[in-house]
Amino acid sequence: NADGLKEPLSFHVTWIASFYNHSWKQNLVSGWLSDLQTHTWDSNSSTIVFLCPWSRGNFSNEEWKELETLFRIRTIRSFEGIRRYAHELQFEYPFEIQVTGGCELHSGKVSGSFLQLAYQGSDFVSFQNNSWLPYPVAGNMAKHFCKVLNQNQHENDITHNLLSDTCPRFILGLLDAGKAHLQRQVKPEAWLSHGPSPGPGHLQLVCHVSGFYPKPVWVMWMRGEQEQQGTQRGDILPSADGTWYLRATLEVAAGEAADLSCRVKHSSLEGQDIVLYWEHHSSVG
């Protein structure tokens, strides 16, 4: 994928609201292009903060102002509504509501939109077409919550338009505006180290790979040309500069480490894999 982001591409907004008691609450709002955070919400000034130079996409200032007002109004209304119905819905303080909504692109075409709400970390209700539906496992509380949310059909219509029309338009503009950044290729650095000893006579070998972009990467411990199936890959973690970090570990008997190497494949390397040998493990690729 030329944009350096795995398909399907998505843009989503996440709203995490913590209700500590009847009057004390807090919320965090963020916008994400797949797994790259592009926007955040400043609650003090009720403004959208653009985290990348291209985060505005092709939306006009007028549209951004409207979105800011929309988030401010909907946050107020959501807090007000949840506070009013908390007792009726048997929401017990403290509790957390998480909402995530957005749209997906596949091969440059809109493949769908989504809006889901979780209560205390569990699926609760979701928005389908023009109305809210309960997750079957969520029970009667969720059914009642949907009844409340579906009282304002016109707001649901606007939500539907935002998801099916505004969001796809925005994601296309965002991809276009961020093309240079998203298509960049940054070569990884790699180094080897010892991990904590797994037991007497055994070693944990660690292969660190950092600073690469885009995210897809292949890292494997090898013996000659033989992939070592015991290789444990960690999660690919984000770095502050927008690149990625990964570690791959392998547990071996102390005497078997000598002819092991760590091989790294990444699109930025253009086929020139990084290979680091354990026997001279101060090497950096």
Epitope: I76, R77, N130, S164
Partner: antibody
Framework: EVQLVESGGGLVQPGGSLRLSCAAS????????MNWVRQAPGKGLEWVSY????????YYADSVKGRFTISRDNAKNSLYLQMNSLRDEDTAVYYC???????????WGQGTLVTVSS | EIELTQSPSSLSASVGDRVTITCRAS??????LNWYQQKPGKAPKLLIY???SLQSGVPSRFSGSGSGTDFTLTISSLQPEDFATYYC?????????FGQGTKVEIK
């Protein structure tokens, strides 16, 4: 600067038809829902019809359902109201209004007068 | 259909007066209420949205309050250009409906 300019009003006999147009400029027309609101002489405001940004959702007031048709052409930044089977009580100034994403009418045209009379 | 009842229907006031107009909804509409000002021969102008938010460019002497069924528009110090008709409008359910209007006249 946001501008909405209505046209197409005039004198028509009961049972006749008219097509109102609203030309929009100064904002991203295709992003917003639009409405028609009318005001009979010396009376208050009455909402007539709503169309979503992509025309996927349309609503009408009961008083015009089956007789009026709202439509839009995002490529031309234009909103329309086709009015058929006009009645005396449809006499009013018709305004097109831009709707915000939080459900208020933030910009209105200057209005076009429709007079239904024999 | 949600009915909105404004009171008073008309009022006479002097420049500098504090003016309060109320709007009562036939059922709870949360904060889905807007206020408009209309001068003779002109289109309505949005003053307040979502019950209490001041529309950009509107003087701060205008304020809105209320939630549920009872709402208020307040003009803290009436100015000559404020003599007009004021309408409330609910956007809680379709069809959106307007109050019958309150005419503010010079005493």
């Amino acid at each position: 600067e946001v501008q909405l300019v209505e046209s197409g009003g005039g004198l028509v006999q009961p049972g006749g038809s008219l097509r109102l147009s609203c030309a929009a400029s100064g904002f991203t027309f295709s992003s917003y829902s639009m409405n028609w609101v009318r005001q009979a002489p010396g009376k208050g405001l009455e909402w007539v019809s709503y169309i979503s940004s992509s025309s996927s959702t349309i609503y009408y007031a009961d008083s015009v359902k089956g007789r009026f048709t709202i439509s839009r052409d995002n490529a031309k930044n234009s909103l329309y109201l086709q009015m058929n089977s006009l009645r005396d009580e449809d006499t009013a100034v018709y305004y097109c209004a831009k709707e915000t994403w939080w459900q208020s009418f933030d910009y209105w045209g200057q209005g076009t007068l429709v007079t239904v009379s024999s | 259909e949600i009915e909105l009842t404004q009171s008073p229907s008309s009022l006479s006031a002097s420049v500098g007066d504090r003016v309060t107009i109320t709007c009562r909804a036939s059922q709870s509409i949360s904060s889905y209420l807007n206020w408009y000002q209309q001068k003779p021969g002109k289109a309505p102008k949005l003053l307040i949205y979502a019950a209490s938010s001041l529309q950009s460019g509107v003087p701060s002497r205008f304020s809105g309050s209320g939630s549920g069924t009872d709402f208020t528009l307040t003009i803290s110090s009436l100015q000559p250009e404020d003599f007009a008709t004021y309408y409330c409008q609910q956007s809680y359910s379709t069809p959106p409906t307007f109050g019958q209007g309150t005419k503010v006249e010079i005493k």
